[in-house]
Interface confidence: medium
């Protein structure tokens, strides 16, 4: 089951997957001035059996005479209409990734591929967040997000990460010492819920993890 939307955006942070669940698709995108070869695949697909997972199909780009070739020329299949974009990541991965059953490694780059990779994640996929250079991570909990299915709908859990403008960068898992984080609801977010009767009140308040505001009115 494909995830319907993108992983959450965290100000001054980027995300990446350490491994990709079987069923994940990666668009075959080419950089400007290049396009997919005519008979080439639209996407790579992470497939596998109980013992081994790998990417099916290969992406191939060829020189293009036309200029507007940043995006695929062929329309994407309907189930691929939601796009998950991540920056190009280094193929270097934590050593334990290959042993994760049912997952594929980051596919190696192909010649003339686009600078951004567009993934189509599946339920159960986990992505990890880090603050961009120049920002420091404040962790309230795990700096990760998981695509979950709830009553037939998919959504991403909210990573408990805040990036502040101090000159110290956090690292991705496998590159940092593990941080203890308070156990809490896995998909909690800073949220507001205010209830009023008769009329609606717009309330500005500093929301904490426990703060809720649902505004209720009647007509």
């Amino acid at each position: 089951e494909l995830c319907d939307d993108d992983p959450p955006e965290i100000p001054h942070a980027t995300f990446k997957a350490m491994a990709y669940k079987e069923g994940t698709m990666l668009n075959c995108e080419c950089k400007r001035g290049f396009r997919r070869i005519k008979s080439g695949s639209l996407y790579m697909l992470c497939t596998g059996n109980s013992s081994h997972s790998s990417w099916d199909n290969q992406c191939q780009c060829t020189s293009s005479a036309t200029r507007n070739t940043t995006k695929q020329v062929t329309p994407q299949p309907e189930e691929q209409k939601e796009r998950k974009t991540t920056e190009m990541q280094s193929p270097m991965q934590p050593v334990d990734q290959a042993s994760l059953p049912g997952h594929c490694r980051e596919p190696p780059p192909w010649e003339n591929e686009a600078t951004e990779r567009i993934y189509h994640f599946v339920v159960g996929q986990m992505v990890y967040y880090q603050c961009v250079q120049g920002y420091r991570a404040l962790h309230r909990g795990p700096a990760e997000s998981v695509c979950k299915m709830t009553h037939g709908k998919t959504r991403w859990t909210q990573p408990q990460l805040i990036c502040t403008g101090e000159m110290e960068t956090s690292q991705f898992p496998g590159e940092e010492k593990p941080q203890a984080s308070p156990e809490g609801r896995p998909e909690s977010e800073t949220s507001c819920l205010v209830t009023t009767t008769d009329f609606q009140i717009q309330t500005e308040m500093a929301a904490t993890m426990e703060t809720s505001i649902f505004t209720t009115e009647y007509q």
């Epitope: 709830t150 991403w156 819920l193």
Partner: antibody, heavy 104, light 106 residues
């Protein structure tokens, strides 16, 4: 009694469209009763059998608001009504409630 | 079914609240809430034993099958409230709350 009523629940601070929102009734001095849930993104709605046909749950995703509506109130509808965010198998954030009193 | 209906204890004591389901419930689908007078319920425990954000570690949940327990290891004055267990059923989709246990100061 007999009047219509629509109460609303405005959410902020999280991705409203990707969480189910539930409604829970609490009659005076009594316990909690689940009424139903709605998925604001596409207005998919599920009702408790006890409340099916008695109330209508709706949502307007453009203004992050869910609604609970009665077409004809009864005295037995007098209760506190809570909206709550559905965390999956439990409700992890609650509004402070709207008290509905039906009297002649 | 929650028992007892009312539990009278003193601050510092240990409280044990019981929740019994009519049929077996997956541990993933059992939650506990606290409600104080004039306030909305608050999630304490989900997945039988996982504490929600900001819940002190004196609250713990356990159990399996049809019998589940909420334990408050050492009662604080602010813990006196009504506690509800809640189970989830996926087909048909249904959230069922227990009738509540009132925890009062002895």
């Amino acid at each position: 009694p007999g009047e219509s009523l629509k109460i609303s629940c405005k959410s902020s601070g999280y991705s409203f469209n990707t969480y189910w929102i539930g409604w829970v009734r609490q009659m005076p001095g009594k316990g909690l009763e689940w009424m139903g849930i709605i998925y604001p993104s596409d207005s998919d709605t599920r009702y408790s059998p006890s409340f099916q046909g008695q109330v209508t749950i709706s949502a307007d995703k453009s203004i992050n608001t869910a609604y609970l509506q009665w077409s004809s109130l009864k005295a037995s509808d007098s209760a506190m009504y809570y909206c709550a965010r559905d965390g999956g198998y439990y409700f992890d954030d609650w509004g402070q409630g709207t008290l509905v009193t039906v009297s002649s | 079914t929650q028992s007892p209906g009312t539990l009278s204890l003193s601050p510092g004591e240990r409280a044990t609240l019981s929740c019994r389901a009519s049929q077996s419930v997956s541990s993933t689908y059992l939650a506990w809430y606290q409600q104080k007078p004039g306030q909305a319920p608050r999630l304490l425990i989900y997945g039988t034993s996982r504490r929600a954000t900001g819940i002190p570690d004196r609250f713990s949940g356990s159990g399996s099958g049809t019998d589940f327990t909420l334990t408050i290891s050492r009662l604080e004055p602010e813990d006196f409230a009504v506690y509800y267990c809640q189970q989830y059923n996926s087909s048909p989709l249904m959230y069922t709350f227990g009738q509540g246990t009132r925890l009062e100061i002895k």
